[in-house]
């Protein structure tokens, strides 16, 4: 039988039960290559409570669907007289990078993991030329996810003082340049992830090969190498090889620009300061509030929520869009939804889509910028489902009463994109990180 | 493709303000960051501000600094130059341009531009 997701093969992923203290190594397409769980476990679940392990999943006892994977095993869960084997089941649902496996829950018999990759998608449209997983757990199980730093389209500049030559790079995936018209982006060689730009010329100085690494618990490190044999005249002979190193910052402070720290013979050492690097507990939460020893700061959307079925309304031209965050208020046009973003065409307000719904909600965060995401709506032809992103920003004079009002600025690929001036995204910092 | 548009140019007097707007068209979004650059004439293109459009963050050039403010209408899809106390040496054609390239300043990265808006400023 075919591997169903051929992208997600090359790597063996960890999903993190963390009330358990459980954590999972997955191989979709081939074993774990672990020991204690056998030569045939695609799931293996280590329990670091107890210190044991057990194969959740047997990859020859793989059945699979478009969207839905399942691994099977021979162990009997002994439930009630039933006879139930133990298995893991992988949902799958069309995101824009490869993603990670999410630990969803555990059933006596079943561990049930969602993954939302661009393996899963019906087109294409997100996939990359190259892609490696892009997060890591630490020892303390906690995750370090930079998903959200992945471009899909352009590049982020390092800093440099060299003035003849311009570096560029991804994190996790290949540049793609392919909408963008006339800049010096556009010579990148296809499936580089760092690009050195000199003069006319552009030169691929490495692209992804492993996935990203934890060298320490606030320090990141991703590897890029020049797969293709053929050394570059300026390289002294020696093969073109990228090191980015993120690290998390001692305290919050805003975004700092990824910075060449060393170079010699084509190889470039990158350092990048970001809170991004740092696990995501720091810099998330589910619900519409920030605040505690865990994450120096106090954030608390939750006084924009609008009661009485009254919502928020942005124009975006063809559409309206219809807003009630922080709460599970019912909007009145996406009856029965679920949505916490409405999607009301004008010319035909019978067309109505869930561009993110309430239960799928995430607060971020990071590098100085503040957002609520709220993912999981209507799907769109790719498969993708939409989402919405809401950019905060801290005006204390704003209007209604200081709660500002969302302002529809783009969508891109399903994805909806808003900016929201308000008092209540002001942000109390503390300094015990 | 981004399309850009200025206006808002003119004849000015020394300590006097304009104000600059560049309205974009196309697909926005697909951009990151926004710049407005000057050219001289005789001179080379040089960068002024940027702003990005998911958040408000800036950068500005040392020679335009506390006189200059770049902002955005993301209702008008629109980005604008206020600038303030003006010198002689301010006069330039100012150019609105787009980049998908994050924390650049260097005219070479930023592939959409717009055609230019002629700024003099004289007594």
């Known amino acids: 039988q075919a591997a169903p997701f051929p992208e997600l093969c090359s790597y063996t992923w960890e999903a993190v039960d963390t009330k358990n203290n459980v954590l999972y190594k997955i191989n979709i397409c081939g074993s774990v290559d672990i020991v204690q769980c056998g030569p045939s476990s695609a799931v293996c679940m280590h329990d670091l409570k107890t210190r044991t392990y057990h194969s959740v999943g047997d990859s020859v006892l793989r059945s699979a669907t478009r969207s839905l994977l399942e691994f099977n095993t021979t162990v009997s869960c002994d439930q009630q007289g039933t006879n139930h084997r133990v298995q893991s089941s992988i949902a799958f649902l069309c995101g824009k990078t490869l993603g990670t496996p999410e630990f969803v829950t555990a059933t006596f018999c079943v561990h049930y993991f969602e993954w939302r990759t661009t393996a899963a998608c019906k087109k294409d449209i997100f996939k990359a030329n190259k892609e490696v997983p892009c997060y890591v757990f630490d020892e303390e199980l906690r995750k370090h996810d930079l998903n959200p730093l992945i471009k899909l389209s352009g590049a982020y500049l390092v800093d440099d003082s060299d003035p003849d030559t311009s570096l560029f790079i991804n994190v996790c995936r290949d540049i793609d340049t392919l909408r963008d018209p006339g800049s010096q982006l556009r010579a990148c060689p296809p499936g580089t992830a760092a690009c050195l730009v000199r003069g006319h010329q552009a030169f691929d100085v490495g692209q992804p090969r492993d996935g990203l690494k934890v060298v320490r618990k606030d320090r990141l490190v991703l590897s890029y190498v020049r797969e293709e044999a053929g050394k570059l005249d300026f390289c002294d002979g020696h093969s073109p090889a990228v090191t980015i190193t993120f690290v998390c910052p001692s305290e919050r402070r805003e975004g700092t620009i990824p910075k060449l720290t060393a170079k010699s013979n084509c190889r470039y050492e990158i350092e990048w300061i970001t809170e991004y690097a740092c696990h995501r507990d720091y810099l998330e939460s589910k619900t519409c509030s920030l605040s505690g020893e865990q994450q120096d700061v106090s954030i608390d959307l939750t006084p924009l929520a609008q009661s009485g079925g009254s919502s928020y309304i942005s124009d975006g031209k063809e559409y309206l869009f219809y807003l009630n965050v922080c709460g599970e208020t019912e909007i009145q046009f996406c009856n029965k939804k679920q949505a916490a973003v409405c999607q009301v065409k004008k010319s035909d307000t019978s067309q109505v889509k869930a561009a993110g719904r309430y239960h799928n909600q995430t607060l971020r965060y990071s590098d100085g910028d503040l957002t609520l995401i709220y993912f999981g709506g209507d799907e769109c032809s790719s498969g993708f489902q939409r989402m919405s992103v809401i950019n905060f920003e801290c005006n204390k004079t704003a209007g209604n009463d200081g709660k500002g009002t969302p302002v529809f600025t783009g969508e891109v690929d399903c994805t909806y994109f808003f900016t929201w001036d308000t008092e209540y995204a002001c942000v109390h910092h503390h300094h015990h990180h | 493709d981004v399309q850009l548009v200025e206006s808002g140019g003119g004849l000015v007097q020394p300590g006097g303000s304009l104000r600059l707007s560049c309205a974009a068209s196309?697909?926005?979004?697909?951009?990151?960051?926004w710049g407005w650059f000057r050219q001289a004439p005789g001179k080379e293109r040089e960068f002024v501000a940027a702003?990005?459009?998911?958040?408000?963050?800036?950068s500005y050039a040392d020679s335009v600094k506390g006189r200059f403010t770049i902002s955005r209408d993301n209702a008008k899809n629109t980005i604008y130059l206020q600038m303030n106390s003006l010198r002689p040496e301010d006069t330039a054609v100012y150019y609105c341009?787009?980049?998908?390239?994050?924390?650049?300043?260097?005219?070479?990265?930023?592939?959409?531009w717009g055609q230019g808006t002629l700024v003099t400023v004289s007594s």
């Open positions: 341009a787009a980049s998908i390239v994050d924390f650049t300043t260097n005219p070479s990265h930023f592939g959409s």
């Open positions: 196309g697909r926005t979004f697909n951009t990151y960051n």
């Open positions: 702003i990005r459009w998911s958040s408000s963050k800036t």
